[in-house]
């Protein structure tokens, strides 16, 4: 009889342990669900707020038509300038028209005055041809005014309202360009 009671007690204890485990699993599952819900809500909130606040250009960038421009506050050599732009999802400024050149030089006058700013233009060492960083040729009116006497690689920069050339290893400010976000509205 005593053995029977002891067996029942053990079975009950086993059942109790199983129920405790199930409860623990349920609590964990509930907590996981709550966390996921929280994450989901946060994600939705972020998506909504970023959609609401999405301007065509990031903070501290200037917009003109389909482009966003960033005028650097640091100096660097041409190659490092390019890498700094890439970190921001942009490339060095590529001037496609006189209108764009006028916008850039006008903006620079307002922001900083007469400094040197690297753009994405360089001179091929073999052919002597000027090419933008994407391989396209500048329009005739947008060729650097003076040929640099440097034996080293030569790159283009903007100063005041002119496009000039200099040794790529000199330190200058730089201008980055990226495409403006199109409004989906």
């Amino acid at each position: 009889k005593l053995l029977q009671v002891s067996t029942i007690a053990m079975q009950q204890q086993e059942k109790l342990i199983q129920q405790e485990r199930a409860l623990l699993n349920f609590t964990e599952w509930k907590r996981s669900c709550a966390l996921q819900m929280k994450y989901c809500q946060a994600f939705m909130q972020n998506s909504l707020s970023s959609a609401h606040n999405s301007s065509p250009c990031p903070n501290n960038w200037i917009q003109n038509r389909e482009s966003c421009y960033y005028v650097s506050e640091i100096w660097s050599i041409w190659h490092t300038s390019q890498e700094n732009c890439l970190k921001e999802g942009s490339t060095l400024l590529q001037i496609e028209s006189k209108e764009e050149m006028d916008f850039i030089t006008g903006s620079l006058r307002k922001i900083k005055g007469s400094y040197d700013y690297w753009v994405g233009l360089s001179q091929d060492g073999h052919s002597g041809r000027w090419l933008w960083q994407d391989g396209s040729s500048p329009s005739p009116g947008l060729l650097p005014a003076e040929r640099s006497q440097s034996a080293n690689q030569v790159c283009g920069y903007v100063k005041s309202n002119s496009l000039l050339s200099s040794n790529c290893s000199t330190w200058k400010y730089f201008i980055c360009e990226k495409y403006a976000l199109r409004s989906s509205v």
Epitope: G89, T91, G135, E177, K178, Y179
Partner: nanobody, 115 residues
């Protein structure tokens, strides 16, 4: 963290073509641009070609008109199509992912152009 895996390197004759691939995995949302590098004289590495997430491209002068960088956003992969290869293009080509805070490098893939 971002992981990069390059492929497509090999031995090719001068004038031939190769296509390098660089597949990104991990925290890919933080990537703003990707580029291909190779060793350069007097410098550690030179940027051969790069492409931003917006599709803007940049090339070193010596490969303009011969190499084309492109991307497949769905596959998180960047390609470097190398045409009219020259012996001086021989190098280990490494892929780099640009993020605002950190740069991530792949292991590199060997390209050998024989004359």
């Amino acid at each position: 963290q971002v992981q990069l895996q390059e492929s497509g390197g090999g031995l090719v004759q001068a004038g031939g073509s190769l296509r390098l691939s660089c597949a990104a995995s991990g925290s890919i949302d933080s990537i703003n641009a990707m580029g291909w590098y190779r060793p350069a004289l007097g410098e550690q590495r030179e940027l051969v070609a790069a492409i931003t997430t917006g599709g803007r491209t940049a090339y070193v002068d010596s490969v303009k008109g011969r190499f084309t960088i492109s991307r497949d956003a769905a596959k998180n992969t960047v390609y470097l199509q190398m045409n009219s290869l020259k012996p001086e293009d021989t190098a280990v080509y490494s892929c780099k992912a640009f993020t605002r805070d950190t740069d991530y490098w792949g292991q590199g893939t060997q390209v050998t152009v024989s004359s």
